[in-house]
Amino acid sequence: SEVEYRAEVGQNAYLPCFYTPAAPGNLVPVCWGKGACPVFECANVVLRTDERDVNYWTSRYWLNGDFRKGDVSLTIENVTLADSGIYCCRIQIPGIMNDEKFNLKLVIKPAKVTPAPTRQRDFTAAFPRMLTTRGHGPAETQTLGSLPDINLTQISTLANELRDSRLANDLRDSGATIRIG
């Protein structure tokens, strides 16, 4: 029951994940990992924040949004087919069994090559259309699995299906949002 997102080879993929700090600067550690969320922590960590900053990241993985405001959405640069799979966003709220974890499924499709006149074929093949926006199209599924019920968070899932890939910036609204405090 993971939320599913799609991107084409060569695009930047965008995996939304949000929380609302109780007050400005009241940040919560977050980890992103490749693979479904385990019982604790993240497996195969690709990026991690602490209460102040991004303290670990790997090549091609970065936070494009303002993580100090709770936007911890992950951008993966220039994706390949090997980037397909489940990613875990874990909001590490201090306390026993207090973490919020979200599994997001990334599906990478081969790049579309637009048919072109014969004389342009070589040019088109060498330079396929690439999107440089931070988003990459609509979420295919908007159903979140059961979420931990914890004392200090109020959980809501925002937005419905996005139908237009031009609404890249609106992808943020399809992420899971939790309020801390």
Epitope: N98, S146, D149
Partner: antibody, heavy 118, light 113 residues
Framework: QVQLQQSGGGLVQPGGSLRLSCAAS????????MSWVRQAPGKGLEWVSG????????YNADSVKGRFTISRDNSKNTLFLQMNSLRAEDTAVYYC???????????WGQGTLVTVSS | EIVMTQSPDSLAVSLGERATINCKSS????????????LAWYQQKPGQPPKLLIY???TRESGVPNRFSGSGSGTDFTLTISSLQAEDVAVYYC?????????FGQGTKVEIK
């Protein structure tokens, strides 16, 4: 007052199964996360398993993953620990414990001894 | 997971004297946003379950005598029994509830000298 009454311990052979129960009174079980903590003879405390108030989320220590299942019946105010594929190293006193506000263990059951031996 | 290490393993103190138990965590259990240390202390007497003594590092549980006090921050914590009584003979455990699985120290046995 809050009470946690445990039952279900005993002697079992390696590979066997046991089900522990923890009957809660003095509070509404569904309002609190709960845990099982064990203590091997002469040793310290080890967290084993935990469950959210609704029962929708469960957590297990690596040492028991795939073998132990925590569950709860909120209508009966009872917590359970199903233990399968038991090993000698699972021999311990098992305590159920109420978690206060996702933080510390504020009430504990009296404990029940599980002995795994052939 | 966070590893909790207590010292000493055992302690013999004369009645009426001060007993001090130390607890060290492998990483900070201080959450800077609320300035709280996610650390508790428990007392376990022979044949009994553990009993919560102190939480949030220094807050005594209801009914716990004021001779018990907790202090520290970050990774280093202390439980102090200001004037040891016979009924204080027990094993004492620290526990972090900051992140991952909740973990306990190995315990410190307090005896009468």
């Amino acid at each position: 007052q809050v009470q946690l009454q445990q039952s279900g311990g005993g002697l079992v052979q390696p590979g066997g199964s046991l089900r522990l129960s923890c009957a809660a009174s003095g509070f509404t079980l569904s309002s609190y996360a709960m845990s099982w903590v064990r203590q091997a003879p002469g040793k310290g405390l080890e967290w084993v398993s935990g469950i959210s108030g609704s029962g929708g989320s469960t957590y297990n220590a690596d040492s028991v993953k795939g073998r132990f299942t925590i569950s709860r019946d909120n209508s009966k105010n009872t917590l359970f620990l199903q233990m399968n594929s038991l090993r000698a190293e699972d021999t311990a006193v098992y305590y159920c414990a109420k978690i206060f506000g996702s933080y510390y263990f504020d009430y504990w059951g009296q404990g029940t001894l599980v002995t795994v031996s052939s | 997971e966070i590893v909790m290490t207590q010292s000493p393993d055992s302690l013999a103190v004369s009645l009426g004297e001060r007993a001090t138990i130390n607890c060290k965590s492998s990483q900070s259990v201080l959450y800077s946003s609320n300035n709280k240390n996610y650390l508790a202390w428990y007392q376990q007497k022979p044949g009994q379950p553990p009993k919560l003594l102190i939480y949030w590092t220094s807050t005594r549980e209801s009914g716990v005598p004021n001779r018990f006090s907790g202090s520290g921050s970050g990774t280093d914590f202390t439980l102090t029994i200001s004037s040891l009584q016979a009924e204080d003979v027990a094993v004492y455990y620290c526990q972090q509830y900051y992140s991952g699985p909740p973990t306990f120290g190995q315990g410190t046995k307090v005896e009468i000298k």
